[in-house]
């Protein structure tokens, strides 16, 4: 349905509060260096303009597209070129090229300091003084650091943030109340950020069809009682919504997401028996709840998948005449039977099935050729199952920090050319898979592990694409999205790598390490570990254990010393010498 004024339409649908939040997110994701004050000024101008269009849809400029209106606002910023360099060149283009240009300039790793949470008292004071401004800052700070964050979901996290502060700021021990609750929100939001980045990568690199296949598999797992036509409708809608958000159409994205939630709640009977609890919530919470919904129970009487996809005489005809429908149906049928598989695995199985038909159907006896296809899935299923088993066992043995270190060693050996901060970030995130997934029931482990790892590896790929340094990483990253994780898992020590020179200053530490929070301390140690591996890529596990054990003792000892600086200055060189010797 066409509207005279797109901006008026969105303002009316979303309401002022959500409209303003989304506009702020959009501007913060496009111009990541601008201060909050500058963006909020633009947001207010856009909001005022939207209100004039609501009052009169025929008012001047109200018929312009939202991209045109937003782009014009951004391009009017003084000193745009000084702050953003070549991004300013986008302003010479016309829509839709101008928006495409803005999207290409989004920086996945902006040069911004880590977001520091203020001290509890200070936080509560500024929240109570001006909740709107406080939450605005939150949206701005998250959005500029995560330029592909799913905007309606970020509004939901801001709402959660608001709830926590409202609740905790009245407590006597504000910090004790705030810290665990805000940590939980932060953890969920960070995972949401990498997951959404993966969705946008899928959309950007492989197009809508690839994303829709992902959505069909996911929806089929969640709603195994829904018909294929229903799953296709939901997958099509989800694809459209994600395309809009990934493309910077945040108002349309949020509006369509709310519409989808409404549709799902109106059609529970044909979708899932688990939706009711979500449908009683307000819009943001409703959409979030539906996105996280538990799987419905699998129908009891499902026939063997072989009947329609192996034994049927018309398999090849059905494949050749409508691959999208036939393979979509295969993916639907297989996925609804396997909530215990990762979406990545289901897509690999569908790809294998497609490749088998493509190879067999033109042959003299196709059924004889494709007859064993389901049995040929076995190795593809076993590989991630073994990955989960070995990694969860290692996690249980080492704990999160130790497991992160094991992953860090492994990945530094695979791709020693990658920068140490990137390797440390990736390994820390990959290492969290243990805490996140290994404690789950058996049936939930595989989907949790593999789909999480895929999202983290996508982040590694996105960062590596900016400054490619490792041929092996490039090779894994440029292949199909669903093959990335197996590709990285299969990488071995890079034999072409020339070890780094041993630099004493890399392993020189000072007393400032003692006052760092635990997380920062860990990062310092892990940075040293990655550098050690870069120096000695073939160091044994025992050698690395010895050196890192020595290092931990050294830090511990000097941080307890009366004269810390002196301890670090005298003991440090001894440690470096011992480490060199141990690795010789």
């Amino acid at each position: 349905e066409a509207h005279k004024s797109e901006i008026a339409h969105r303002f009316k649908d979303l309401g002022e509060q959500h409209f303003k939040g989304l506009v702020l997110i959009a501007f913060s994701q496009y111009l990541q260096k601008c201060p909050y004050e500058e963006h909020i000024k633009l947001v207010q101008e856009v909001t005022d303009f939207a209100k004039t269009c609501v009052a009169d849809e025929n008012a001047e400029n109200c018929d312009k597209s939202i991209h045109t209106l937003f782009g014009d606002k951004l391009c009017a910023i003084p000193k745009l070129r000084d702050n953003y360099g070549e991004l300013a060149d986008c302003c010479a283009k016309q829509e839709p090229e101008r928006n495409e240009c803005f999207l290409q300039h989004k920086d996945d790793n902006p040069n911004l300091p880590p977001f520091q949470r203020p001290e509890a008292e200070a936080m509560c004071t500024s929240f109570q003084e001006n909740p709107t401004s406080f939450l605005g800052h939150y949206l701005h700070e998250v959005a500029r650091r995560h330029p592909y964050f799913y905007a309606p979901e970020l509004l939901y996290y801001a709402e959660k943030y608001n709830e926590v502060l409202t609740q905790c700021c009245t407590e006597s021990d504000k910090a004790a109340c705030l810290t665990p609750k805000l940590d939980a929100v932060k953890e969920k939001a960070l995972v949401a950020a990498v997951r959404q980045r993966m969705k946008c990568s899928s959309m950007q690199r492989f197009g809508e069809r690839a994303f829709k296949a992902w959505a069909v598999a996911r929806m089929s797992q969640r709603f195994p009682n829904a018909e294929f036509a229903e799953i296709t409708k939901l997958a099509t809608d989800v694809t459209k919504i994600n395309k809009e958000c990934c493309h910077g159409d945040l108002l349309e994205c949020a509006d369509d997401r709310a519409e989808l939630a409404k549709y799902m709640c109106e059609n529970q009977a044909t979708i899932s028996s688990k939706l009711q609890a979500c449908c009683d919530k307000p819009v943001l919470q409703k959409s979030q709840c539906l996105a996280e919904i538990e799987h419905d129970n699998i129908p009891a009487d499902l026939p063997s998948i072989a009947a329609d996809f192996v034994e049927d005489k018309e398999v090849c005809k059905n494949y050749a005449e409508a691959k999208d429908v036939f393979l979509g149906t295969f993916l639907y049928e297989y996925s609804r039977r396997h909530p215990d598989y990762s979406v990545s695995l289901l897509l690999r199985l569908a790809k294998k099935y497609e490749a088998t038909l493509e190879k067999c159907c033109a042959e003299g006896d196709p059924p004889a050729c494709y007859g064993t296809v389901l049995a040929e899935f076995q190795p593809l299923v076993e590989e991630p199952k073994n990955l989960v088993k070995t990694n969860c066992e290692l996690y249980e043995k080492l704990g999160e920090y130790g497991f992160q270190n094991a992953v860090l060693v492994r990945y530094t050996q695979k791709a020693p050319q990658v920068s140490t901060p990137t390797l440390v970030e990736a390994a820390r995130n990959l290492g969290r898979v243990g805490t996140k997934c290994c404690t789950l029931p058996e049936a939930q482990r595989l989907p949790c592990v593999e789909d999480y790892l895929s999202a983290i590896l996508n982040r590694l790929c996105v960062l590596h694409e900016k400054t490619p340094v490792s041929e092996k990483v490039t090779k894994c990253c440029s292949g199909s999205l669903v093959e990335r994780r197996p590709c990285f898992s299969a990488l071995t020590v890079d034999e072409t790598y020339v070890p780094k020179e041993f630099k004493a200053e890399t392993f020189t530490f000072h007393s400032d390490i003692c006052t760092l929070p635990d997380k920062e301390k860990q990062i310092k140690k892990q940075t040293a570990l990655a550098e050690l591996v870069k120096h000695k890529p073939k160091a044994t596990e025992d050698q690395l254990k010895t050196v890192m054990g020595d290092f931990a003792q050294f830090v511990d000892k000097c941080c307890k010393a009366a004269d810390k600086d002196n301890c670090f200055a005298t003991e440090g060189p001894n440690l470096v010498a011992r480490s060199k010797e141990a690795l010789a």
Epitope: C316, A320, E321, A322, D324, E358, C361, A362, G364, P366
Partner: antibody, heavy 121, light 110 residues
Framework: EVQLLESGGGLVQPGGSLRLSCAVS????????INWVRQAPGKGLEWIGI???????FYATWAKGRFTISRDNSKNTVYLQMNSLRAEDTAVYYC???????????????WGQGTLVTVSS | DIQMTQSPSSVSASVGDRVTITCQSS???????LSWYQQKPGKAPKLLIY???KLTSGVPSRFSGSGSGTDFTLTISSLQPEDFATYYC???????????FGGGTKVEIK
């Protein structure tokens, strides 16, 4: 050496019929899919249809009904039966093998030299 | 309706030149089912590239293909005298019945 050789082309009146043959030598035809592709004078390529080794056929939407592909593996030959011919069917008709290992992809690695069909009164 | 648009329809170039031909498909081709053919006057087409970027054996490495989804490119890095010909892209879709060729690009001597 593998060869595909078309025959049966010539002059035919509008509304008439013609059967083209594609004789294959150097390989056992029973293992391969064969396509028919045509090219009007001075124009581009146009896919007509395919016959798989099993005998299953598929046609371009515009070709359904008037064109029929068949095969005789004992003679190592594929046929294209064309009915209700029109002036716009005037073209060089080629047979071409689909690259082994593919069934529906437009990858044709072996081609005949073509046979000219002229539809005119 | 399936549309396979090749551009330019003709290009004049000299030996040693780099030549780029593009092929735009609507909708997107199925699973990178895209091929490139070379045809010389009076001869049958010859398959150069399949799966958008894979070179058929015996085809010189100066030919390369790239792209995915809807936009594809054939590049001849350094044109040789034997490369003057007409080039066609071919696309496969969800239905085999939609198999289509582009309109062709004639590469002529400048």
């Amino acid at each position: 050496e593998v060869q595909l050789l078309e025959s049966g082309g010539g002059l035919v009146q509008p509304g008439g019929s013609l059967r083209l043959s594609c004789a294959v030598s150097g390989i056992d035809l029973s293992n391969y899919a064969i396509n028919w592709v045509r090219q009007a004078p001075g124009k581009g390529l146009e896919w007509i249809g395919i016959i798989w080794a099993s005998g299953t056929t598929f046609y371009a939407t515009w070709a359904k009904g008037r064109f029929t592909i068949s095969r005789d593996n004992s003679k190592n030959t594929v046929y294209l039966q064309m009915n209700s011919l029109r002036a716009e069917d005037t073209a060089v008709y080629y047979c071409a093998r689909t690259v082994p290992g593919y069934s529906t992809a437009p990858y044709f690695d072996l081609w005949g030299q073509g046979t000219l069909v002229t539809v005119s009164s | 309706d399936i549309q396979m648009t090749q551009s330019p329809s003709s290009v004049s170039a000299s030996v040693g030149d780099r030549v780029t031909i593009t092929c735009q498909s609507s909708p997107s081709v199925w699973s990178n089912f895209l091929s490139w053919y070379q045809q010389k006057p009076g001869k049958a087409p010859k398959l150069l590239i399949y799966e958008a970027s894979k070179l058929t054996s015996g085809v010189p490495s100066r030919f390369s293909g790239s792209g995915s989804g809807t936009d594809f490119t054939l590049t001849i890095s350094s044109l040789q005298p034997e490369d003057f010909a007409t080039y066609y892209c071919g696309g496969g879709y969800s239905s085999i019945s939609d198999t289509t060729f582009g309109g062709g690009t004639k590469v002529e001597i400048k």
